[in-house]
Interface confidence: low
Amino acid sequence: VPRWRQQWSGPGTTKRFPETVLARCVKYTEIHPEMRHVDCQSVWDAFKGAFISKHPCNITEEDYQPLMKLGTQTVPCNKILLWSRIKDLAHQFTQVQRDMFTLEDTLLGYLADDLTWCGEFNTSKINYQSCPDWRKDCSNNPVSVFWKTVSRRFAEAACDVVHVMLNGSRSKIFDKNSTFGSVEVHNLQPEKVQTLEAWVIHGGREDSRDLCQDPTIKELESIISKRNIQFSCKNIYRPDKFLQCVKNPEDSSCTSEI
C-alpha cells in the first residue's frame, strides 16, 4: 500500500537533484583552484543532512550550518554584485567582469542555483512530487531557508562599494519582499560598507525616464541612509550596450551614457 504523501503547492525536487549537486560541486572545484580542497561528497552529505528526514516547513538556518562551514569561501568583499529580479543580466555581467561576484558565483550559490528540493518528515526520501510554496504553504521550507542563509552571509561579507542590479521594467523596481529587500539590504554592515550603488536596468529601447526617481528607489534610499550607508543610483538605459562596453571599454561608443 503506497504511503500517504503530503501534497504541497510548489513543484517537487528537481530531477536528479543529488547527481546535479555533486556534479556542480566537482565542476566548480575544478574551475576554482582556491576551492580544490573541498570534498564534494562531504558537501553533498551536509546538504542532504539539512533537509532529509525533516519536516519541509520546519527548516532552520541552523540546519544549514554544516554546509555553510564546508562552503566557506573568500570573495573580495569590495567586488560584490547583488541583484533583484534580473538574475540573467547580473550573471552575464560577472561572466564578463570576472573580478566581480554574484552569490551564484560562489560555491554554495552555484550548487543551488535554479534548483528545488525538499524531503519528508521521518523518512530518508527526497520528495520529487511537490515541495512547499513560500506563499501558499510555508516560508521555512528548505529552498527559502537556504537562500535566506547564504544571502545573509553574502551581504554581511560585503564592504566598500556594493552594487545591486535592479529590474526597471517591473512595477516595483525595489521590492521589500524580495531576497534583496528583505534579507540583503538589512545585513549590509554599516561599518564596512560605504555606499550601495543601484544600477536600474531599463527594458524599453526608447525609455529615457530617470528611474532613479522611482518611489521604490526612494524607499530603498531611505532604508539604506537610515542604516548609515550612502546611496547612489545609475540608470542603465541600454543593457546590451552596457555589456558590450564592459567587454570592450575602448570602444569609441562607450564614452557616452549607456
Partner: antibody
Framework: QVQLVQSGAEVVKPGASVKMSCKAS????????MHWVKEAPGQRLEWIGY????????NYNQKFQGRATLTADTSASTAYMEISSLRSEDTAVYFC?????????????WGQGTLVTVSS | DIVLTQSPATLSLSPGERATISCRAS??????????MHWYQQKPGQPPRLLIY???SRATGIPARFSGSGSGTDFTLTISPLEPEDFAVYYC?????????FGGGTKLEIK
C-alpha cells in the same frame, strides 16, 4: 591627529540620569560612527552602541536599548551618551571610541573614559 | 549573542618568555575569508589599545613580538619575547555580529 576627550567623573544617585560627552578633533566628525563601551569593575567590556553623527542614526546593543540615549552635536563635534534610571550596576568607566574607518571596524581611537559612580 | 571565552584568566610569566592567550567564540566569527576578531591591551587607568585586527594583522605602531592567529571559533594572541611593559590585561573582541562582544580578559602578570 585624532583625539577623543571625555567629560569628567560623575557621582549620581540611584534612579537619576547622567549625561557625558566626548569631544572629537583631528578628523571629520560627521564621517565616522562614535561608539560607547562600558567597563564595570570585575566585568568584561561591553559595547553599548554607536551613533552616526552624519545623520543621527543609532544602533544599540539590545541590553542598553531604552536606558542609554546617544546623541551628537555636529557643530561642536561632540557626541553624548545619557543613561537614565541609574542603578548600582551602572557604576563603571564609560569610553567613547572610534573605528579606524571604512572596512576597519575595530576600535582604533579611544577617549580617556568617564567614571560614573552610582551611590546614595 | 556571540560569547567569547578567554583562557587563561591569569598568566604568570617572566620577561623574555612567551605568552599565549586563547579566545574561543561560541560560534564562528569568520565571514568569507575574514576572521572578525581583534585583540586589545589595557593598563590600569587607561583605555584599551588596539594590538591585532582581523585575527592576524598588527595595528600601526605595534611591535612585531605581538602576533595573532586563528580562524572560525579559535583565536590566539602570542607575545614573544615578553617585555616588562607587556604586563597588562588583554581582551579579544568580535564584530562579526551585533552586539559586538568582548572576552572576559586575561591578566598577564610578572612571575
Amino acid at each position: 591627529q585624532v583625539q577623543l576627550v571625555q567629560s569628567g567623573a560623575e557621582v549620581v544617585k540611584p534612579g537619576a540620569s547622567v549625561k557625558m560627552s566626548c569631544k572629537a578633533s583631528g578628523y571629520t566628525f560627521t564621517s565616522f560612527n562614535m561608539h560607547w563601551v562600558k567597563e564595570a569593575p570585575g566585568q568584561r567590556l561591553e559595547w553599548i552602541g554607536y551613533i552616526y553623527p552624519g545623520n543621527g542614526g543609532t544602533n544599540y546593543n539590545q541590553k542598553f536599548q531604552g536606558r542609554a540615549t546617544l546623541t551628537a552635536d555636529t557643530s561642536a563635534s561632540t557626541a553624548y551618551m545619557e543613561i537614565s534610571s541609574l542603578r548600582s550596576e551602572d557604576t563603571a568607566v564609560y569610553f567613547c571610541a572610534r573605528t579606524g574607518g571604512l572596512r576597519r571596524a575595530y576600535f582604533t581611537y579611544w577617549g580617556q573614559g568617564t567614571l560614573v559612580t552610582v551611590s546614595s | 549573542d556571540i560569547v567569547l571565552t578567554q583562557s587563561p584568566a591569569t598568566l604568570s610569566l617572566s620577561p623574555g618568555e612567551r605568552a599565549t592567550i586563547s579566545c574561543r567564540a561560541s560560534e564562528s566569527v569568520d565571514s568569507y575569508g575574514n576572521g572578525f576578531m581583534h585583540w586589545y591591551q589595557q593598563k590600569p587607568g587607561q583605555p584599551p589599545r588596539l594590538l591585532i585586527y582581523l585575527a592576524s594583522s598588527r595595528a600601526t605602531g605595534i611591535p612585531a613580538r605581538f602576533s595573532g592567529s586563528g580562524s572560525g571559533t579559535d583565536f590566539t594572541l602570542t607575545i614573544s619575547p615578553l617585555e616588562p611593559e607587556d604586563f597588562a590585561v588583554y581582551y579579544c573582541q568580535q564584530n562579526k555580529e551585533d552586539p559586538w562582544t568582548f572576552g572576559g580578559g586575561t591578566k598577564l602578570e610578572i612571575k
